[in-house]
């Protein structure tokens, strides 16, 4: 069963990969980045259903395309190069979901822009917060 | 209303330079990319670049790298089109387009600018 | 450099249903648009991101794609729907975009 500090460790690093998915949307959905309307000619995939820490199996699967979609902002509204916040995303995705199991990711037909795929993702964190408080 | 507006038919001759104009109207020119379409006689349409008003940023086609060049006065709302030494195969109806602001397509077209080279 | 192969052309009976193809190596991870051209006229957006339809362009026409493969398909085709159709993408650098060749749709 989890402990009370497990849950704590858990809920922040949900708030961290949360806090760091906000800063790539508010970085990209700046208005004085040009880019934004070239980034959304890329697809992202969806979870079919996304309400446990395992699904974010299909978050980590799309990160790498999403650092691709990330080296074209070449913005300024990120405090790290592409490459080092998406590795520090991995890393949360990674303790979050856990390795002991291996779960397919299971996809959506419908794919998504990166401002809607972000989004997504936002809200999972906050769902899983709010159960977790 | 939101509408770009082109120059007038042109006819030159080889060598000669040119330079064509889309006036836009309607809508911030300075926050959407503006893109050139060629479409040559009886042929489809071929994309040649985009530049972004705002600051400037262009991105050409392979194809027409170093053929032509594409640039924006945004005082005056209007990109432009420019060859320094026009040839026969030049000959084509030029498009400009905007690429629309939330789903990156060519949204708004020009009415075109047909451009002939003869000798 | 990225190319776009769509059908030269194709044919269909009045209110028959009419597709068209466009393949590219690129599809999986970006989108497609589809342009309808009727003669001596500019390009007009009729699909956007694969599978949406601007406002104001008929519910007969429908897009999708899966794997290297985008289809528009226009159900109970009008005379009035002859045209070139052209799918448009960019390659995966974001920097470059295509046209396809183009299809000639016929009704008749």
């Known amino acids: 069963a989890p402990t009370s500090s497990s849950t704590k460790k858990t809920q922040l690093q949900l708030e961290h990969l949360l806090l760091d998915l906000q800063m790539i949307l508010n970085g990209i959905n700046n208005y004085k980045n040009p880019k934004l309307t070239r980034m959304l000619t890329f697809k992202f995939y969806m979870p079919k259903k996304a309400t446990e820490l395992k699904h974010l199996q299909c978050l980590e699967e799309e990160l790498k395309p999403l650092e691709e979609v990330l080296n074209l902002a070449q913005s300024k509204n990120f405090h790290l190069r592409p490459r080092d916040l998406i590795s520090n995303i991995n890393v949360i995705v990674l303790e979050l979901k856990g390795s002991e199991t291996t779960f397919m990711c299971e996809y959506a037909d419908e794919t998504a822009t990166i401002v809607e795929f972000l989004n997504r993702w936002i809200t999972f964190c906050q769902s899983i917060i709010s159960t977790l408080t | 209303q939101v509408q770009l507006v082109q120059s007038g038919a042109e006819v030159k001759k080889p060598g000669e330079s040119l330079k064509i104009s889309c006036k836009g109207s309607g809508y911030s020119f300075t926050s959407y990319w503006i893109g050139w379409v060629r479409q040559m006689p009886g042929k489809g349409l071929e994309w040649m670049g985009i530049?972004?008003?705002?600051?400037?940023?262009?991105r050409y086609s392979p194809s027409f790298q170093g053929q032509v060049t594409i640039s924006a006065d945004k005082s005056i709302s209007t990109a432009y089109l420019q060859w320094s030494s026009l040839k026969a195969s030049d000959t084509a109806m030029y498009y400009c387009?905007?690429?629309?602001?939330?789903?990156?397509?060519?949204?708004?077209w020009g009415q075109g600018t047909m451009v002939t080279v003869s000798s | 450099s990225y190319e776009l192969t769509q059908p030269p052309s194709v044919s269909v009976s009045p209110g028959q249903m009419a597709t068209i193809t466009c393949s590219g190596d690129?599809?999986?991870?970006?989108?497609a648009y589809w342009y309808q051209q009727k003669s001596g006229q500019a390009p007009v957006l009729v699909i956007y991101?694969?599978?949406k339809r601007p406002s104001g362009i008929s519910e007969r026409f429908s897009g999708s794609s899966s794997g290297t493969v985008a289809t528009l398909t226009i159900t109970g085709a009008q005379v009035d729907d002859e045209a070139d159709y052209y799918c448009?993408?960019?390659?995966?650098?974001?920097?470059?975009?295509?046209f396809g060749g183009g299809t000639k749709l016929t009704v008749l």
């Open positions: 690129a599809l999986p991870r970006k989108y």
């Open positions: 448009f993408s960019t390659d995966l650098s974001g920097d470059r975009s295509v």
């Open positions: 387009a905007r690429l629309s602001g939330s789903y990156s397509a060519f949204d708004i």
């Open positions: 530049i972004y008003p705002g600051d400037s940023d262009t």
């Open positions: 991101e694969d599978s």
